[in-house]
């Protein structure tokens, strides 16, 4: 079986992850993507993914999950902002290509988040604050992956609208240089 | 539109093993979702078995892991179920339905069939 | 493993009138990051499989008349029939699905 290796991303509450996913331009670039989480004993769950076909460079946000698809580089960009504890665990960016099984990039992302201010003065992290504009997305970012996607008869109230809206702000606060480790299984 | 259909005997004596089949029609299996089998004794609630994806990828409910397997024939467009060494406890409507792993629910559902555990 | 509670175990309501069901989950089925709750809601007639009707907690099954609503997040959600009609006499449960897939005891809805 082959080993599966991961990258050890430690953060802060409050920080960002930001990861780049590296694929096979020529292969996968308008392929739908998809970043979801691996729990132990269970199949991944997806929590974000581009649309169907991906459209470069067009942010889909998802929560707190930002999706971005750069075709010209063969990179899918993903960033999680506003990290809390609870979101430690072990990540990956798949591409979907049904009938296929979901294609993994990348090695898995091996989030852990731990409590405490990363901007303290005399801290060695680089702490800089952004403010990303967020397009609207034309669609609602599903997943479904399939030949046949759903129809949605009802949006879920604002408070957990999956898209941003127009000229929607999202502040990445504390966005640092990240220490990479991998881990072998 | 997706149908299924569930398929097997009726009847199953203790300690044997439960074996039943689900046709898939109106969707090829291989083209996504996962296919699931969900259980309810006569009167009582639901109970999730385990999923399976066309790639043969199984997951579980850990309580039962021990005893079932689910396995899938692409070419047939069926997967089926087995649960060994079964009890009383085993009687149950059995369902199979596709499980959208992204949505995170079972839709649509097979009609259900009967398995009594008797000697 | 995630324990879904339904409460009450049975309603009778009469025509028009609202039916509310409660499901409390033993831990959380919100995935914060992407701000969805794992959690659906099914109607199961008598003699019959059950029926999706609610997926992320209130998102609606395509099909479903809206008088079918879903609300709450974490780990209390509610089920609301705003006008109760006759073919809605059924067994309702909730499911999980942050960590493998549970289902609630199921609600009883009759007609007063």
């Known amino acids: 079986a082959t080993k599966l290796t991961e990258e050890k991303y430690e953060l802060k509450e409050g920080q960002t992850l930001d990861v780049k996913c590296d694929y096979t331009l020529e292969k996968f670039a308008s392929s739908q993507k998809a970043w979801q989480i691996i729990r132990d004993g269970e199949m991944p769950k997806t929590l974000a993914c581009t649309e169907r076909p991906s459209k470069n460079s067009h942010p889909v946000q998802v929560g707190r999950i930002i999706l971005e698809d750069y075709h010209d580089h063969g990179l899918l960009r993903v960033r999680m902002v506003n990290l809390q504890v609870e979101d430690s665990g072990l990540y990956q960016c798949v591409i979907y290509q049904p009938p296929k099984e979901p294609h993994m990039l990348f090695d898995r992302i091996r989030l852990v988040v731990t409590k405490g201010f990363s901007g303290t003065p005399g801290s060695n992290e680089n702490s800089t604050q952004n403010v990303y504009k967020i397009p609207p997305t034309t669609t609602k970012a599903l997943c479904p992956l399939y030949t046949s996607p759903r129809t949605v008869t009802q949006a879920p109230p604002k408070s957990t609208a999956d898209v941003s809206t127009p000229d929607s702000e999202i502040n990445l606060t504390n966005v640092t240089d990240i220490i990479r480790v991998p881990v072998f299984n | 539109q997706v149908q299924l259909q569930e398929s097997g005997p009726g009847l199953v004596k203790p300690s044997e093993t439960l074996s039943l089949t689900c046709a898939v029609s109106?969707?090829?299996?291989?083209?996504?979702?996962?296919w699931g089998w969900i259980r309810q004794p006569p009167g009582k609630g639901l109970e999730w078995i385990g999923s399976?994806?066309?790639?043969?990828?199984?997951y579980y409910n850990p309580s039962l892991k021990s005893r079932v397997t689910i396995s899938v024939d692409t070419s047939k467009n069926q997967f089926s179920l087995k649960l060994s060494s079964v009890t009383a406890a085993d009687t149950a409507v059995y369902y199979c339905?596709?499980?959208?792993?992204?949505?995170?629910?079972?839709?649509?559902w097979g009609q259900g069939t009967l398995v009594t555990v008797s000697s | 493993d995630i324990v879904m509670t339904q409460s009450p175990d049975s309603l009778a309501v009469s025509l028009g009138e609202r039916a509310t069901i409660n499901c409390k989950s033993s831990?959380?089925?919100?995935?914060?990051?992407?701000?969805?709750?794992?959690l659906a809601w099914y109607q199961q007639k008598p003699g019959q499989p059950p029926k999706l009707l609610i997926y992320?907690?209130?998102t609606r099954e395509s099909g479903v008349p809206d008088r079918f609503s879903g609300s709450g997040s974490g780990t209390d959600f509610t089920l609301t029939i705003s006008s109760l009609q006759a073919e809605d006499v059924a067994v309702y449960y909730c499911?999980?699905?942050?960590?493998?897939?549970?289902f609630g005891g199921g609600t009883k809805v009759e007609i007063k």
């Open positions: 499911q999980q699905d942050h960590s493998f897939i549970t």
């Open positions: 831990q959380s089925v919100l995935y914060s990051s992407n701000n969805k709750n794992y």
């Open positions: 992320w907690a209130s």
């Open positions: 109106g969707y090829s299996i291989s083209s996504g979702y996962y």
């Open positions: 399976i994806y066309h790639s043969g990828s199984t």
């Open positions: 339905a596709r499980h959208d792993d992204y949505l995170s629910s079972f839709d649509p």
